[in-house]
Interface confidence: low
């Protein structure tokens, strides 16, 4: 798949930021702010938590989530999974693209200890027009939102 | 803001590296090496710890800092904040762009235990000509410098 | 070194993924999948674990490795080093480019506790045609492979 950068052509890019509405608790992907503050879309679209590709090519996609808690709540998995996933017309299920597993909870030796951790993912993937990329965090109860600078999601064509 | 890549145009990029002089202890941003070793500036400028934008556009900005210590020194905050901040003529205060909070100290259960951690940040932001981006770490006493490969700061136009 | 993006020119990029054969135990660099699944090479070559540059320029290079274990095995270093290194005709030894040190083991307070951690590195470096970049992890026994989404290595020209 030869992908070319033609002169005078806008390079697709986006940076979406975490907001109070990001965590749905529904088991779905995280939702994102697309316009306010640092958030923008340029040559990419957005729908229900997903960056939607309008132009096929190779994209560097990335996401960071801020994790935090007080001790380890009972029933909370010791492993946090943060991942970027693709939804495509060619497959019925989401496809894992980039994934991290962390055990940040284990840092807090006492049950009342406050802890923070951050997970960053980034990598180049090929995306077709119409394909979607979403971010998931399991368990999302540990994601700490504030002002859009600590948890975010973005992409740009390379 | 439509940003175009014209043919035969050099794409702004920079990679600055940690040096002995990076940690000032003055409460200011980290300072960086701009020329020696792996460090370079291409289409961007540098001033007092800041990458200075000479051409408006969307930039992927990034920073990594190497953290480390022996146990948790008394008086040391349990939370380390590592962030990229923007200085702009339009606002008197720095603006948070990308931020991480970590509690690496909590890993060391005994007071004499050596620990290491690393914090990476990266994301796309829009920057105007003349705007500056800096890196801050609180508490900077935990930043471990060596040869410019473990703590660094960079950007490139996307 | 002025590097230009000419119109209609393919931009070098690659994303290599972790596979069962990645960990050699030989003290050499990690090996990678170059074709299956998410892995690809475009304007870059691959040889014995290394991305080989075919066109000189500035490249954003990156790697993520998934770490994990059960407690801290005896004889296992408390520090994990994950780095990107350059091999060049001009020097007999590998050159450190981007490096992280982490102490993930310290999170597990009991010897039977399962822990996970992830290390991400990314930065812009100048590479000449024929130069190579490899990934090393010490101690590689803690790298956890699965399906190519958790440990990977890539680059693209900026």
């Amino acid at each position: 798949l030869i992908q070319e950068r033609r002169s005078h052509e806008v390079n697709p890019a986006a940076h979406l930021t975490g907001a109070n509405s990001s965590l749905t608790g529904s088991g779905g992907p995280l939702l994102w702010e697309t316009q306010l503050g640092l958030a923008f879309l340029r040559g990419l679209s957005y729908h229900d938590g997903a960056l939607v590709v309008t132009k096929a090519g190779y994209y560097y996609i990335y996401s960071k989530v801020q994790l935090g808690g007080v001790g380890c709540p009972l029933g909370l998995a010791s492993t946090i999974t943060h991942g970027l996933y693709k939804r495509t017309p060619r497959y019925p299920e989401e496809l894992e693209l980039l994934v991290s597993q962390q055990s940040p909870c284990g840092r807090a030796t006492s049950s009342s200890r406050v802890w923070w951790d951050s997970s960053f993912l980034g990598g180049v993937v090929h995306l077709e027009a119409g394909e979607k990329v979403v971010v998931r965090v399991l368990d999302e109860r540990l994601v700490r939102l504030r002002d859009g600078t600590r948890s975010y999601f973005g992409a740009f064509m390379v | 803001l439509i940003q175009e890549r014209r043919s035969h145009e050099v794409n702004p990029a920079a990679h600055l590296t940690g040096a002995n002089s990076s940690l000032t202890g003055s409460g200011g941003p980290l300072l960086w090496e701009t020329q020696l070793g792996l460090a370079f500036l291409r289409g961007l400028s540098y001033h007092d710890g800041a990458l200075v934008v000479t051409k408006a556009g969307y930039y992927y900005i990034y920073s990594k800092v190497q953290l480390g210590g022996v146990g948790c020194p008394l008086g040391l905050a349990s939370t380390i904040t590592h962030g990229l901040y923007k200085r702009t003529p339009r606002y008197p205060e720095e603006l948070e762009l990308l931020v991480s909070q970590q509690s690496p100290c909590g890993r060391a259960t005994s007071s004499s235990r050596v620990w290491w951690d690393s914090s990476f940040l990266g994301g796309v932001v829009h920057l105007e000509a003349g705007e500056k981006v800096v890196v801050r770490v609180l508490d900077e006493r935990l930043v471990r410098l060596r040869d410019g490969t473990r703590s660094y700061f960079g950007a490139f136009m996307v | 070194l002025i590097q230009e993006r000419r119109s209609h020119e393919v931009n070098p990029a690659a994303h290599l993924t972790g596979a069962n054969s990645s960990l050699t135990g030989s003290g050499g660099p990690l090996l990678w999948e170059t074709q299956l699944g998410l892995a690809f090479l475009r304007g870059l070559s691959y040889h014995d674990g290394a991305l080989v540059v075919t066109k000189a320029g500035y490249y954003y290079i990156y790697s993520k490795v998934q770490l994990g274990g059960v407690g801290c095995p005896l004889g296992l270093a408390s520090t994990i080093t994950h780095g990107l290194y350059k091999r060049t005709p001009r020097y007999p030894e590998e050159l450190e480019l981007l490096v992280s040190q982490q102490s993930p083991c310290g999170r597990a307070t009991s010897s039977s506790r399962v822990w996970w951690d992830s290390s991400f590195l990314g930065g812009v470096v100048h590479l000449e045609a024929g130069e190579k970049v490899v990934v090393r992890v010490l101690d590689e026994r803690l790298v956890r492979l699965r399906d190519g989404t958790r440990s990977y290595f890539g680059a693209f020209m900026v």
Epitope: - | - | T34, Q35, L41, R42, G43, L44, S45, Y46, H47, D48, A50, V52, T54, K55, R87, T88, P89, R90, P92, E94, A129, G130, E131, K132
Partner: antibody
Framework: QVQLVQSGAEVKKPGASVKVSCKAS????????IHWVRQAPGQRLEWMGW????????KYNEKFKGRVTITRDTSASTAYMELSSLRSEDTAVYYC???????????????WGQGTLVTVSS | DIQLTQSPSFLSASVGDRVTITCKAS??????VAWYQQKPGKAPKLLIY???TRHTGVPSRFSGSGSGTEFTLTISSLQPEDFATYYC?????????FGQGTKVEIK
Amino acid sequence: QVQLVQSGAEVKKPGASVKVSCKASGYTFTSYYIHWVRQAPGQRLEWMGWIFPGSDITKYNEKFKGRVTITRDTSASTAYMELSSLRSEDTAVYYCAREDYGISTYSAMDFWGQGTLVTVSS
Amino acid sequence: DIQLTQSPSFLSASVGDRVTITCKASQDVGTAVAWYQQKPGKAPKLLIYWASTRHTGVPSRFSGSGSGTEFTLTISSLQPEDFATYYCQQYSSYPLTFGQGTKVEIK
């Protein structure tokens, strides 16, 4: 200018060994790989292995492993290829060639020796 | 091992003709491909490396293209001294391998 000069033709009996030399001049011998490639009559070129003269590192084609040994003498700027347990199908022209990049890189072979014909016949 | 298959194996052409030789790899080799010219009784000469980069001193009528598994050597205007056998070679993975060759003859 870069030159690779090989030793003369050899006739050997099956089971014997042959050692072909390749003397380099016009460049820094220790900074470039030397490859050995052979070509049987009417056949395609076949890579046998290389040596990096600066550190004596070698890499061999598995097909020849155990039968081929590549060595060098830095003081004489000369590389050697020895092939043992010769058989009739080893009859070929053997070439040494320099790789055009230095250590830890991979590329094409930009300068070749003139070739050495090795005939294996009883 | 990576197999390289050249086509055609033989080619008859006249001076001034445009000649195209293809090389197909059995697996992705990126752009780690070289082309050589060999005349009878002589050693091969490097023409193209990294799929499309002309070696020093090689005339501009020789050009290479391709990536992945399909590569092409083109001689834009055949000259009398170009009648020879041409080989492609991959150096993406060991063992290094060559194509079977394409012999360009005078028509």
